[in-house]
């Protein structure tokens, strides 16, 4: 018998969509075969309608698309509006059409039931509103309106224009009977539930005069939306409940294996742990929609999601929801990368951030999550250059090493910058990832002076000091400005005496201007690097003043003064719901990237030896 | 919680015909699933069929040792599944579970069935 299994019968009605998931061995022969569906006619010959490498027969064209997870061994094909014409036979199967590896697979797509003549039909989703309408004869105006549902062979009255109404129907039916002229009255009733599926009668009046009208509704359990994202990437559910609980709190949950449904997050500020640092509720519009962003995608998030609306912010039966089937692709065209990054108080970090390398003239952003209420995470910087103005110094975005990834550098650490951070383009909304920023004990690794006033005219020496471990780096001084850091000549001065157990590795890099000019005033880094992956850097504040005393000044960082007071901006920050993360050769150190080419202006020198090791303190 | 109750079994000749019931309650609402398993002394449990289904689409899944001979069906309104079983043999004699699940991977694994029964004997003589 053949080691492929799936549903032998599939049965729905016109309009709908199935999800027809079939197994195979995991082998690693099978994972990579080529998946189909087809279907069986009368020769016995299987017509593939569409397989896992991109065909799609015209019939199938905009309905239909398959979808492979090789590491649970099973494809899946999704089929939407149904008509009767796909009933009929199919196989689902591994590699050739004729070939044995296959699943006999039956679909019937019927019409759904017989209704009596005139019957009007209602379908309507379970939680929301529905409005019957039910038409009568001038005679009847001043009868009894009343409507009935039909259960079995008996009538069961539910409401009625003498005010009855059935308890089951109570505080969520109303009948309205409309001024004279208006030969319609509508019964409406709220939060819909499941057990409200069937057939109504409308009636007004009694006796053989009596108006009937047959209404047959259909309450509908939310059908999951099926979702498939890669490991560690991103998923948005748009959740839209109807303007009746637009302003009624709203939630995601999960189900879990008791059958209820754990909030994630929910709008009177709840949020599952498990979520922390990845999850954003992204405020409702006037008519009541909201969406959820997770970043950080991880098998474990696997499952079935309702957002639903409810005052307690969790799920009630007979309120609106909608539905979601979560898949997480382990075979993820998303990197690997670190989670969380190490840097030491004092120190600097590097994060690499992934993109989708099909789009590196997407706008890249980075920004800080918020947990507070609903989770927001306000920019910082982005590509084109604009900074937090209490990040100015200390913060870049650079485009290397391209192809796929960019890196954010944030160095002068404290134990405030702890947190989580997002990666985002505004292109695919797949790519955001979080990353976390730990703060440890330690020391940072290169040594620079404090605050550094320069005089007009003079030449200014700056001093880095790299520890031997570092021996093996290209060390390099630039210029930072909001739109980068701007790569400055550096003079390598031989073996630092800040370092005792490796003087002859160690290295003392200077920056020196000469002259010091009014445009030389800003921040400065040194910094590590190999090749276009940058490791630590240390930032230095120089103030330019008029010229008082005669002679050159060298800085040493025994005359350092403390950094100076970072500017802070008013929060009115435009927030993102995007992306973030980084590259997988990185896992143990950050790196930088940028060559940011010349410096107009300034300085002159050269730059010392390059080359990589690992990290130490203020990295990961 | 979902309480799973099943009925019908009974002693059977081997050529009839038997239908088992499996009546669910509490908080059905999510169940995505529901199934049959048995097991026969001294085996292990096996799987025998499964019923899954998304608003008003059904899935059918059936061991290739029941294929043609037993059916599953579903009755949304009595929150009840159904096993009709035909040309009955002397190797389906075991005890049938009902089990229900909220999301399968796999229909054929008993592990990822949240709910179960407590069986009901299925034997038949030859």
């Known amino acids: 018998k053949s080691p492929v299994f799936g549903p032998q019968e599939v049965s729905s009605v016109e309009g709908n969509s199935v999800s027809i998931k079939c197994y195979y061995p995991p082998t690693s022969v099978n994972r990579h075969t080529r998946k189909y569906w087809c279907r069986k006619g009368a020769s016995g010959r299987c017509i593939t309608l569409v397989s896992s490498e991109g065909y799609v027969s015209s019939n199938y064209a905009g309905r239909a698309n398959l979808t492979n997870f090789p590491e649970n061994g099973t494809f899946v094909v999704n089929i939407a509006q149904l008509s009767r014409d796909d009933s009929g036979h199919y196989k689902c199967g591994l590699g050739i059409n004729s070939r044995g590896l296959s699943f006999d697979v039956s679909l019937e797509v019927s019409q759904g039931p017989e209704l009596p003549n005139g019957t009007e039909v209602y379908t309507v989703d379970v939680g929301r509103t529905v409005t019957i309408k039910c038409p009568f004869k001038t005679e009847n105006a001043p009868k009894t309106k009343a409507l009935y549902k039909k259960i079995g062979q008996t009538s069961v009255l539910v409401i009625d224009s003498r005010n009855y109404v059935n308890p089951n129907y109570k505080d969520r039916i109303r009948l309205r009977i409309p001024g004279t002229g208006q030969l319609i009255f509508t019964v409406v009733i709220d939060r819909l539930r499941l057990s409200d599926h069937g057939l109504y009668l409308c009636q007004a009046g009694d006796g053989s005069n009596r108006d009937e009208k047959n209404a047959d509704l259909q309450v509908l359990e939310p059908e999951p939306e099926l979702v498939y994202e890669d490991l560690r990437g991103s998923v948005t559910f748009h959740c839209a409940l109807g303007l009746e609980v637009a302003n009624v709190a709203k939630f995601l949950c999960r189900v879990n294996s008791r059958e209820t449904c754990d909030v994630v997050i929910n709008t009177l500020g709840k949020r599952d742990s498990a979520f922390e640092g990845r999850i954003l509720l992204n405020p409702q519009d006037k008519d009541g929609s909201f969406s959820v962003v997770i970043t950080g995608l991880r098998k474990e998030d696997e499952g079935r999601y309702l957002c639903g609306a409810h005052s307690d912010g969790q799920l009630q039966e007979g309120w609106p929801i909608q539905a979601w089937q979560l898949f997480v692709n382990e075979e993820s065209t998303i990197p690997r990368s670190p989670t969380v990054v190490k840097g030491v108080a004092g120190g600097s970090v590097a994060v690499l951030c992934p993109y989708n390398p099909k789009e590196s003239q997407s706008l890249k952003y980075w920004c800080l999550w918020e947990g507070a209420q609903n989770g927001r995470c306000p920019l910082l910087v982005e590509s084109q250059g604009l900074v937090q103005e209490q990040y100015e110094g200390r913060l870049s975005l650079l485009q290397e090493p391209g192809n796929g990834t960019f890196t954010v550098i944030l160095n002068q650490l404290t134990t405030q910058d702890a947190g989580f951070y997002w990666c985002l383009t505004n292109g695919d909304t797949r790519w955001r990832t979080t990353v976390e920023i730990k703060i440890i004990e330690g020391e940072p690794n290169l040594k620079v002076p404090g605050n550094v006033t320069a005089v007009l005219g003079e030449t200014l020496n700056i001093p880095c000091h790299f520890p031997c471990k570092f021996s093996s780096y290209e060390k390099y001084w630039c210029k930072w400005s909001n739109t980068g850091c701007q790569t400055l000549p550096s003079q390598d001065e031989g073996p630092s005496e800040a370092f005792v157990n490796c003087d002859e590795n160690s290295r003392l890099v200077s920056l020196t201007l000469n002259p010091v000019t009014r445009a030389d005033e800003g921040w400065y880094w040194c910094g590590v690097k190999q090749g276009h992956f940058y490791g630590e850097t240390a930032a230095v504040y120089v103030a330019v003043e008029e010229k008082k005393v005669a002679g050159s000044r060298y800085v040493s960082p025994a005359k350092a003064d403390a950094a100076p007071d970072e500017k802070v901006l008013d929060s009115g920050v435009r927030e993102i719901e995007n992306k973030a993360i980084q590259d997988p050769r990185l896992f143990a150190e950050e790196k930088v990237v940028a060559d940011t080419g010349d410096q107009a202006g300034g300085s002159r020198a050269s730059v010392d030896s390059s080359s990589s090791e690992e990290q130490g303190g203020s990295s990961k | 919680e979902v309480q799973l109750v099943e009925s019908g079994g009974g002693l059977v000749q081997a050529g009839d015909s038997l239908r088992l019931s499996c009546a669910a309650s509490?908080?059905?609402?999510?169940?995505?699933?529901v199934g049959w398993f048995r097991q026969a002394p001294g085996k292990e449990r096996e799987f025998v069929t499964t019923?899954?289904?998304?608003?008003?689409?059904?899935?059918?899944y059936y061991a290739d040792s029941v294929k043609g001979r037993f059916t599953i069906s579903r009755d949304n309104a009595k929150n009840t599944v159904y096993l009709q079983m035909n040309s009955l043999k002397p190797d389906d004699t075991a005890v049938y579970y009902c089990?229900?699940?909220?999301?399968?991977?796999?229909?054929?694994?008993?592990?990822?069935?949240?709910?179960w029964g407590q069986g009901t004997q299925v034997t038949v003589s030859s």
């Open positions: 019923i899954t289904w998304s608003g008003s689409t059904n899935y059918k």
């Open positions: 509490g908080r059905t609402f999510t169940t995505y699933g």
């Open positions: 089990a229900a699940s909220t999301v399968l991977t796999d229909p054929r694994v008993p592990t990822e069935y949240d709910y």
